[in-house]
Interface confidence: medium
């Protein structure tokens, strides 16, 4: 990887024990306002493969609230609005971070978690299993 | 929201300050041992709506490397193999959380980031701008 | 209705600099790829660049690393920085937007909708 | 680069009259060929797109056909107004180009 030399102006609190504790700022900075705000607002309802959106919450993660898609057919709209069966909707999954509190209910205290999201659906062409 | 009674063992670190700074473990949990360690590794390849994946790498986040999808038509493919402009491939875009590092080049202090990155493609029906 | 305004033409020595400008309105600007489209007097029409959705950046070889195409999707604008310029980027410059109806971050788009022109004379 | 060559460069003719351009392109550009109209000291204006769609607004008189590298701007009824300079593009290939334009005139 890259080396980058460390700043001299850094908190000092190293800790000799890898993996290690870190000081996080929760003042998130957003870099998204360059990106479309509508983004994919709309696509679950327009795409061939639509999906609805379910609320996970957890108050002991962060962010508390997750959207996870749900793919409502299990193959894909076709041209005349029916739901096709030689194509399949499935989901756009993708591992995330988050902050879990640990000790559990502690309010500055967290371990980074990787979870596993469904974003959105995708229709895909199905694989076919041929028999020997 | 719901209101959980703080642990007696949490880390004393509070900041009166708010937005505040956190320990963060860093040794991350990996929710996912039960998935699909495929996940949707294929449907790049096989959605009506293709992507390619394209690595953005940035030694002063973490994670370091993120895959950003990029749809490879601006139609979608048809059952006969050809781009169909009457549809649209879309991005699927979600906004997650990185950390960044904060001042640079800190091995120990960070800040959260939210940016927004595009996990695969859908396809939809093109919106139909009407003249009035 | 969709509206592109430029700026920032004129005249500049061989080698200077100039940086065009493109107000654009009536549209959600961030969701839509961008593009600069030149005409030499009495010519025909020169894709220039195009900037996407996302921010990815496309140019004609004789412009690469010479020019470059950038966005502000908080103030509708679009930007073409023309460094090292050359007596046969003497043209006018267009900006042009594609139509309303693909969303996508993918650049191969037509022009729908294209400002007045704004010309740019390289000459000593 | 995709060439695209625009016959004829120039055409004189009448109101009423029947007029067909050209656009052959040196390699298949499939169906990502457009149509625009430029009047002097004007930006273009799109016409058609994707070979034979017709813009919103456009008269019915104009239409596109073709396919792979042969395309045709047909305007089946000239009007003074269509009196301009008619260009080709391309968007299947990087960098995507212009035809060098036909011009229509008056007879």
């Known amino acids: 990887g890259i080396t980058i030399p460390r700043n001299p102006g850094c908190p000092n609190s190293e800790d000799k024990n890898f993996p290690r504790t870190v000081m996080v700022n929760l003042n998130i900075h957003n870099r998204n306002t360059n990106t479309n705000p509508k983004r994919s607002s709309d696509y679950y309802n327009r795409s061939t493969s639509p999906w609805n959106l379910h609320r996970n919450e957890d108050p002991e993660r962060y962010p508390s609230v997750i959207w996870e898609a749900k793919c409502r057919h299990l193959g894909c709209i076709n041209a005349d609005g029916n739901v096709d069966y030689h194509m399949n909707s499935v989901p756009i999954q993708q591992e995330i971070l988050v902050l879990r509190r640990e000790p559990p209910h502690c309010p500055n205290s967290f371990r980074l978690e990787k979870i596993l999201v469904s974003v959105g659906c995708t229709c895909v062409t199905p694989i076919v299993h041929h028999v020997a | 929201g719901i209101t959980i009674p703080r642990n007696p063992g949490c880390p004393n670190s509070e900041d009166k300050n708010f937005p505040r700074t956190v320990m963060v473990n860093l040794n991350i949990h990996n929710r996912n041992t039960n998935t699909n360690p495929k996940r949707s590794s294929d449907y790049y390849n096989r959605s009506t709506s293709p992507w390619n994946l394209h690595r953005n790498e940035d030694p002063e986040r973490y994670p370091s490397v993120i895959w950003e999808a990029k749809c490879r038509h601006l139609g979608c493919i048809n059952a006969d193999g050809n781009v169909d402009y009457h549809m649209n491939s879309v991005p699927i875009q979600q906004e997650i959380l990185v950390l960044r590092r904060e001042p640079p080049h800190c091995p120990n202090s960070f800040r959260l980031e939210k940016i927004l990155v595009s996990v695969g493609c859908t396809c939809v029906t093109p919106i139909v701008h009407h003249v009035a | 209705e969709v509206q592109l305004v430029e700026s920032g033409g004129g005249l500049v020595q061989p080698g200077g600099s100039l940086r065009l400008s493109c107000a654009a309105s009536?549209?959600?600007?961030?969701?839509?790829?961008m593009a600069w489209v030149r005409q030499a007097p009495g010519k025909g029409l020169e894709w220039v660049a195009t900037i996407d959705a996302a921010g990815d950046t496309y140019y004609r070889d004789s412009v690469k690393g010479r020019f470059t195409i950038s966005r502000d999707n908080a103030k509708n604008s679009l930007y073409l920085q023309m460094n090292s310029l050359r007596a046969e980027d003497t043209a006018v410059y267009y900006c042009a937007a594609p139509p309303q109806t693909y969303e996508g971050s993918i650049y191969r788009l037509w022009f729908a909708h294209w400002g007045q022109g704004t010309l740019v004379t390289v000459s000593s | 680069d995709i060439q695209l060559t625009q016959s004829p460069s120039s055409l004189s003719a009448s109101v009423g009259d029947r007029v067909t351009i050209t656009c052959r392109a040196d390699?298949?550009?499939?169906?990502?060929m457009h149509w625009y109209q430029q009047k002097p000291g004007k930006a273009p204006k799109l016409l058609i797109y994707?070979?034979?769609n017709s813009e919103i607004g456009v008269p019915d008189r104009f239409s596109g056909s073709g396919s792979g590298t042969d395309f045709r701007l047909t305007i089946s009824s000239l009007q003074p107004e269509d009196f301009a300079t008619y260009y080709c593009?391309?968007?299947?290939?990087?960098?995507?180009?212009f035809g060098q334009g036909t011009k229509v005139e008056i007879k």
């Open positions: 994707l070979v034979s």
């Open positions: 593009q391309q968007t299947y290939s990087a960098p995507h180009t």
């Open positions: 390699e298949s550009v499939k169906t990502l």
């Open positions: 009536g549209f959600t600007f961030p969701s839509y790829g």
